[in-house]
């Protein structure tokens, strides 16, 4: 069953005019790919490739499609019901704590560490201490070994920006 976006979830400028009491949770809402008209009577399609809505809603406007940044590849285009899916280019990744940009993956692990995970669009290479097996903090070391890693192959979206 589709999730609902209700008026309470919206910024004031996105709220529709007050409507009659609904007899079911989705009555008076418009389906994914649409938004509600200002008078609350009609459903209006989002514009293909320009904007979208993913849930039953009473939005006065559809949400603007994300444009992939340079340094990102478009995995799937924006449709009226789904935002663009962007992914970091090979050799770069996006971290949860810095989702606004793709960062270059490190080329190797610090001395005394071994690589146990490749560069992927959503994570840097993973390094562990040879002896203890504990993970490296992720900070770029002052000195790196010359052992390099090949970038991982993109497998899934690193973020649904929007």
């Amino acid at each position: 069953e589709s999730a609902l976006i209700t008026q309470q979830d919206l910024a004031p400028q996105q709220r529709a005019a007050p409507q009659q009491k609904r007899s079911s949770p989705s009555e008076g809402l418009c389906p994914p790919g649409h938004h509600i008209s200002e008078d609350g009577r009609d459903c209006i399609s989002c514009k293909y490739g320009q904007d979208y809505s993913t849930h039953w809603n009473d939005l006065l406007f559809c949400l603007r499609c994300t444009r992939c940044d340079s340094g990102e590849v478009e995995l799937s285009p924006c449709t009226t019901t789904r935002n663009t899916v962007c992914q970091c280019e090979e050799g770069t990744f996006r971290e949860e704590d810095s989702p606004e940009m793709c960062r270059k993956c490190r080329t190797g692990c610090p001395r005394g560490m071994v690589k146990v995970g490749d560069c992927t669009p959503w994570s840097d290479i993973e390094c562990v201490h040879k002896e203890s097996g504990t993970k490296h903090s992720g900070e770029v070391p002052a000195v790196e070994e010359t052992v390099t890693s090949s970038p991982g192959t993109p497998a899934s979206p690193c973020s649904l920006s929007g």
Partner: antibody
């Protein structure tokens, strides 16, 4: 294979009500809209409304509010349209059609409604 | 309500010809236009949606185009079985509305 099987022809008296059915098969009933469309002899097509069986949301064309009532039974994958206070203007072929919200990809064979005293 | 106008009620063509059926919306419908084919005694059949996307199983001789208020269904090489009524429909704003239809006759 997607199929929509509609109930048979109806001959009813003015002022009466009628309920026609549309049994869906070959797809997940709760994931698509069922629309109802009216076609009078020799005339064009008129959208009556939709029901989305997944959350039982309905929407009607203003013209058919109070005239048509759309319902759906998930257990039997069947959609229904009740038409009330019938007049000769309601004599037509009524189609159910599966679709996305706004366009109709598979259609039933149609139910002929004749309103006559 | 948005009015969809198919100015040609009848069109006549020959097998192998290229024919274009036009439809005009009373306001911008942002490419949210579908085309249907209906033969006598049959249900309508979806050909095109989103102005130019061909529905599954529709021969590639059928193509849709247009933007704003003006839309066209083109049959590149008409076949005898294409004799039918053709309807445009806007799926931009409820209530969804249809054109009055264009009857294509094969000479």
């Amino acid at each position: 294979e997607v199929q929509l099987q509609q109930s048979g022809p109806e001959l009813v008296k003015p002022g009466a009500s009628v309920r026609m059915s549309c049994k869906a098969s070959g797809y997940t009933f709760t994931s698509y809209f069922i629309h109802w469309v009216k076609q009078r002899p020799g005339q064009g097509l008129e959208w009556i409304g939709w029901i989305y069986p997944g959350n039982v949301n309905t929407k009607y064309s203003e013209k058919f509010k109070g005239k048509a009532t759309l319902t759906a039974d998930k257990s039997s994958s069947t959609a229904y349209m009740q038409f009330s206070s019938l007049t000769s203007e309601d004599s037509a072929v009524y189609f159910c059609a599966r679709g996305e919200a706004g366009y109709f990809d598979y259609w039933g064979q149609g139910t002929t409604l004749t309103v006559s005293s | 309500d948005i009015v969809m106008t198919q100015s040609h009620k009848f069109m006549s063509t020959s097998v192998g010809d290229r024919v274009s059926i036009t439809c005009k919306a009373s306001q911008d419908v942002s490419t949210a236009v579908a085309w249907y084919q209906q033969k006598p005694g049959q249900s309508p059949r979806l050909l095109i949606y989103w102005a130019s996307t061909r529905h599954t199983g529709v021969p590639d001789r059928f193509t849709g185009s247009g933007s704003g208020t003006d839309y066209t269904l083109t049959i590149s090489s008409v076949q005898a079985e294409d004799q039918a009524l053709y309807y445009c429909q806007q799926h931009y704003r409820t209530p969804w509305t249809f054109g009055g239809g264009t009857k294509l006759e094969i000479k």
